[in-house]
Interface confidence: low
């Protein structure tokens, strides 16, 4: 009865040329114990012999003996349960279908997991938390579709090129759920790495490059402003003109309004970039900033002390 | 029914060669490792090597390489046994005996054996 | 080479009796696979050896329940629980985990 068969392993494993893979696999047979193995790359039942044709990687004696170029596929399970597999080095043209043939005393099964081989070594692909805000602690993921005990390798993370200082935590699974190496990255953006590429490189045991992903961080912050006065002491006489500008160096989204202050209470009607103030006089003497707000909330520039002499 | 039936064995002069046969019949033999184990009169078991007749891979015993060599006819399913420069301490039965064709590896059927007398 | 050494070399036992014999390797025979390949045979006088115990503990088909086999490592031991008339013969224990494969030196069961 076909249906006793159980088996678990991830669906779909994925390496490139020259690395291996390593196939986590557990199985039940109910009625006993496994009495033959046969792998097959894909295989195609032949309905005129009732048998599977297709190139046959291993076969159930002790020591895997296959024919003599596929020693580097090795049968890592037992008789009952364990049917994990292993090939090193994976070539290019073992893309396609596994076909695990179990025989025991009464039943036969064939289960099928499939393997994808690239050329090359395939890209890693970073996470992004939905939004990052300056100064606020984030997890940047890195994820690789890969891992095998026979070929180590190691995930970096760079801004700009540049190594980050930031310590990252590497996880692996090879689990019959999930095969994959993680790097996780806990990292607090400041505004001026908006825009900036980040950077997570796959490299081999040595250290060689393999293959990378890049994203553009986008740091939400508030607007980062500049105040200029004119004169740039901002010391006057009463009577005399002052004017103060407002540059804003960077905002993540867009500015929405803009507005002036004194002494922390905001000016009416003052909602452009330029302060004009004419024939100043002693009580408009005091501190003064610009604040210009975006969606993430108000930024404000360094204040301006204004000093309004007597004539 | 697996079978393994041994021939080839007799009297030889010591520096002289013999090639002992194993037919097999009752399963697939190129997908069986094939061994070679031999016993001195009132002495031991001694593995002498194997083949696998699906690709000709061999291994040895140390003492054996050189001398001895296993081969395999998976057209005839049977396996040889070609012992060259014999000596007076090759006489012994020599037995083929089949690998379980499981990674439970164990012998599960034996020939009956050939004997071999290297005398002058 | 991995030596195997049993003991003792002979032994006279009466029907019924419990009978261990002993089985040392020179250095661990576990396969690179986990898997310890540990056999014992038994043979009797003009006859071909024949398959008792595989992988340390399990019993090969066909063979009574009263013979068993354990151990780890480089200890091994086969066990006849209750002897009988036919289990007078020569009990070979055999390492397969590593090249080149070895015999012990073999254990006479004779009649008291």
């Known amino acids: 009865d076909s249906s006793k068969w159980v088996f678990e392993h991830p669906e779909t494993l994925y390496a490139w040329e020259g690395a291996c893979v390593w196939i986590p696999c557990t199985y039940r047979a109910l009625d006993g114990d496994l009495e033959s193995f046969i792998l097959f790359h894909n295989p195609e039942y032949n309905k005129n012999t009732s048998k599977f044709d297709g190139t046959r990687l291993y076969e159930s004696t002790k020591d895997g003996k296959v024919p003599s170029e596929q020693k580097r596929v090795q049968f890592l399970g037992d008789k009952n349960k364990n049917c994990t597999l292993s090939i090193h080095p994976v070539h290019l043209n073992d893309s396609g279908q596994l076909g695990l043939r179990m025989e025991s005393k009464t039943e036969k099964w064939m289960e099928r997991i499939h393997l994808n081989v690239s050329e090359r070594p395939f890209p890693p692909h970073i996470q992004l938390p939905p939004e990052i805000q300056e100064s606020q602690e984030v997890t940047l993921t890195c994820l690789l579709n890969f891992s095998c005990y026979g070929y180590p390798i190691q995930l970096q993370w760079l801004l700009e090129g540049v190594p980050m200082r930031q310590a990252a935590v590497t996880s692996t699974s090879l689990t019959i759920k999930s095969v994959f190496t993680r790097s996780e990255l806990k990292f607090s953006p400041q505004w001026s790495h908006h825009g900036k590429i980040v950077t997570c490189q796959l490299q081999d045991a040595d250290g060689k490059f393999l293959s990378n992903d890049t994203v553009q961080l986008n740091v939400k912050h508030t607007p980062k402003l500049e105040i200029k006065v004119t004169p740039s002491d901002a010391i006057v006489r009463e009577g005399d003109s002052v004017t103060m500008t407002c540059e804003v160096s960077s905002s993540n989204p867009e500015y929405t309004t803009v507005s002036w202050l004194k002494d922390g209470t905001s000016l009416k009607k003052q909602n452009t970039f330029t302060l004009n103030l004419r024939e100043v006089t002693k009580d408009q003497s005091g501190k003064y900033c610009c604040q210009v707000s975006n969606d993430v909330g108000p930024g404000r520039s360094e204040e301006v002390f204004l000093q309004v002499q007597y004539a | 029914e697996v079978q393994l039936v041994e021939s080839g064995g007799g009297l030889v002069q010591p520096g002289g060669s013999l090639r002992l046969s194993c037919a097999a019949s009752?399963?697939?033999?190129?997908?069986?490792?094939m061994n070679w184990v031999r016993q001195a009169p009132g002495k031991g078991l001694e593995w002498v090597g194997r083949?696998?007749?699906?690709?000709?891979?061999?291994n040895y015993s140390g003492k054996f390489k050189g001398r001895f060599t296993i081969s395999a006819d998976t057209s005839k399913n049977t396996a040889y046994l070609q012992m060259n420069s014999l000596r007076a301490e090759d006489t012994a039965v020599y037995y083929c005996?089949?690998?379980?064709?499981?990674?439970?590896?164990?012998?599960?059927?034996w020939g009956q054996g050939t004997l071999v007398t290297v005398s002058s | 080479d991995i030596q195997m050494t049993q003991s003792p070399s002979s032994l006279s036992a009466s029907v019924g009796d419990r009978v261990t014999i002993t089985c040392r390797s020179s250095?661990?025979?576990?396969?690179?696979?986990?898997?310890?390949?540990l056999e014992w045979y038994q043979q009797k006088p003009g006859k071909a050896p024949k398959l008792l115990i595989y992988?340390?503990?399990n019993r090969f088909s066909g063979v009574p329940s009263r013979f068993s086999g354990s151990g780890s490592g480089t200890d091994f031991t086969l066990t006849i629980s209750s002897l009988q008339p036919e289990d007078f013969a020569t009990y070979y224990c055999?390492?397969?985990?590593?090249?080149?494969?070895?015999f012990g030196q073999g254990t006479k069961v004779e009649i008291k």
């Open positions: 005996a089949r690998d379980g064709s499981s990674w439970d590896w164990y012998f599960d059927v």
């Open positions: 009752g399963y697939e033999f190129s997908r069986s490792w």
């Open positions: 083949i696998y007749p699906g690709d000709g891979d061999t």
């Open positions: 250095q661990s025979i576990v396969h690179s696979n986990g898997n310890t390949f």
């Open positions: 992988k340390v503990s």
């Open positions: 055999f390492q397969g985990s590593q090249f080149p494969y070895t």
